[in-house]
Interface confidence: low
Amino acid sequence: HPICEVSKVASHLEVNCDKRNLTALPPDLPKDTTILHLSENLLYTFSLATLMPYTRLTQLNLDRCELTKLQVDGTLPVLGTLDLSHNQLQSLPLLGQTLPALTVLDVSFNRLTSLPLGALRGLGELQELYLKGNELKTLPPGLLTPTPKLEKLSLANNNLTELPAGLLNGLENLDTLLLQENSLYTIPKGFFGSHLLPFAFLHGNPWLCNCEILYFRRWLQDNAENVYVWKQGVDVKAMTSNVASVQCDNSDKFPVYKYPGKGCPTLGDEGDTDLYDYYPEEDTEGDKVRATRTVVKFPTKAHTTPWGLFYSWSTASLDSQMPSSLHPTQESTKEQTTFPPRWTPNFTLHMESITFSKTPKSTTEPTPSPTTSEPVPEPAPNMTTLEPTPSPTTPEPTSEPAPSPTTPEPTSEPAPSPTTPEPTSEPAPSPTTPEPTPIPTIATSPTILVSATSLITPKSTFLTTTKPVSLLESTKKTIPELDQPPKLRGVLQGHLESSRNDPFLHPDFCCLLPL
């Protein structure tokens, strides 16, 4: 070709028109072009319709082209990667109809100040979205709803002050979230949902440590090994986790995960609070963490949580990482989950000291509770493995343009193994949530003293109680299947659906599962 460099690599016909001072698409490019580099030209405006003759085009690099407008017309049915980074776009073009097969979209280092609600509509195949280095202040709540396959999301280096509570809803494949270097001061309750997020970058934000931060604090404690500091040019797999990088802006860079939360309302105080925010005091004994006697009081009204972390009993696991396939009530962080009217919990539940030991992760899913009183472990067929298979190899491709088919700018340099931060010894009370409409209480409000019996096998770990009786004889158990500082989660099951599925979860009583 007279202007561009053409090369054939395997089945790919790659055309490199980088840095040719082009103001438009050069004529007469090979019709079977699969990869087209147009980086560092002076295109200013560009119409995707001009590429319609290139029906095999799978990768298009338009980075550093001084683009102020991208016209989206026609259809490029197999285009999978579009790099628009380092341009001057002030609005994100609606690409869904034009690029139905898009899997990687890089719009980093543009001038985006906002995104419309339907910005990603039609991009159902999208796996990687890079919006780093723009000027975004807020995001529309349902922004990512059209992209359920999303694996990597970079919102780093923007001006974000807040995040919509349900932003990550339904993103079961998300493995890398980059939120560093924004203006975030809190994380809404339930923001992370219940699925595992192996790589989170949250540093460089002015986190405001007050009672509103307790949900985030607990999430950090539970996911300490998954919180990293971004280092340019270093592959996330080679980075060392650093939960202490997430620091309170209002208290001399104190790590958020250690924030004591003194003076914040706790469960049992006046008002309704989210279960996830209350945890027992913990004291450490070498390799173990003891959860001291915990009293959890539930109010005499239907308990509402704006994020639904009530586990289906059949999916509750003792592994510190939550399964990615969970009860439907966990999938929406916006919808509120209210106990059905026929069950109004009003009891005190005591859990005597249970000691958890940190040992290697169980990679097997939890098993459903059998219907007999003697539980027999059996794999749950519909559940995915706890360990995330995807290891992000492209954490932040926007740091540099990516004109060739090689992976854009991840890197790997040996780094020490992640160290587990010591758990905090303070309770984690939470602010009260909006109270739901009170419902009449049931006639009896029993106090149930439970020390959960357990059946532990190498492949599955779960707790079950066979009948609602006081079990005081087993006051201390060592459970060897946990790998992290233990997480004690009050798990109440009040959903009609799950009580249909499990005879032991009768709505007249409730079980506490330490997780």
């Epitope: 840095k19 270097e181 340019q232 926007t398 540099e400 992976t407 890197t411």
Partner: antibody
Framework: QVQLVESGGGVVQPGRSLRLSCAAS????????MSWVRQAPGKGLEWVAS???????YYPDSVLGRFTISRDNSKNTLYLQMNSLRAEDTAVYYC????????????WGQGTLVTVSS | DIVMTQSPDSLAVSLGERATINCKSS????????????LAWYQQKPGQPPKLLIY???TRESGVPDRFSGSGSGTDFTLTISSLQAEDVAVYYC?????????FGGGTKLEIK
């Protein structure tokens, strides 16, 4: 540990060409942006070229059109093809690893001297 | 291009004393999005390549002694060696890593008085 070893320097006449190489080890070469920085005798540092992990090259105006940076990830080697050399290109040429778009240089080689003289 | 100007050209300081080197850029190196200044400092000893000391104005590279510190914002920056050691004799360069082409200051030669 990270090591960068330059080679290919020498004495060359003005207008001629020279190709420098930089052998990298101790890190995943293909994943890092790489650069050449030069230092004329007794002078300061001057950035010459960079190439991203994906292969996109960048140059300052002083060498644009004369120098070409390239990389062979299979050989963990960085190259600098220098054409139409001038006397003012005389310098020690350092190969440096950079962290990406931030483009400061965290590891440097020992350098190779290029002398352009008639 | 962003021009980097260092001062002084040379500096003689007694062992154990504080050394201060200044660097001025022709335009701001502050990224308003993340409030970071994109300035790095390097140390070059005779016959050796440069060594990264500090980036983002004040972040010390791993392994760099804490007697080295960086400060400043916008266009004016400072490298401080709190207590000069014999091994600190070198030429020090600032570099902006804010905008291509990446440019260096002219260098400051630090000697022992």
């Amino acid at each position: 540990q990270v090591q960068l070893v330059e080679s290919g320097g020498g004495v060359v006449q003005p207008g001629r060409s020279l190709r420098l190489s930089c052998a990298a080890s101790g890190f995943t070469f293909s994943s890092f942006a790489m650069s050449w920085v030069r230092q004329a005798p007794g002078k300061g540092l001057e950035w010459v070229a960079s190439i991203t992990s994906a292969g996109t090259p960048y140059y300052p105006d002083s060498v644009l059109g004369r120098f070409t940076i390239s990389r062979d990830n299979s050989k963990n080697t960085l190259y600098l093809q220098m054409n139409s050399l001038r006397a003012e290109d005389t310098a020690v040429y350092y190969c440096a690893r950079s962290r990406g778009y931030e483009d400061y240089f965290d590891y440097w080689g020992q350098g190779t001297l290029v002398t352009v003289s008639s | 291009d962003i021009v980097m100007t260092q001062s002084p050209d040379s500096l003689a300081v007694s062992l154990g004393e504080r050394a201060t080197i200044n660097c001025k850029s022709s335009q701001s190196l502050l990224n308003s999005r993340n409030q970071k200044n994109y300035l790095a400092w390097y140390q070059q000893k005779p016959g050796q390549p440069p060594k990264l000391l500090i980036y983002f104005t004040s972040t010390r590279e791993s392994g760099v002694p804490d007697r080295f510190s960086g400060s400043g914002s916008g266009t004016d920056f400072t490298l401080t060696i709190s207590s000069l050691q014999a091994e600190d004799v070198a030429v020090y360069y600032c570099q902006q890593h804010y905008s291509s082409p990446w440019t260096f200051g002219g260098g400051t030669k630090l000697e022992i008085k």
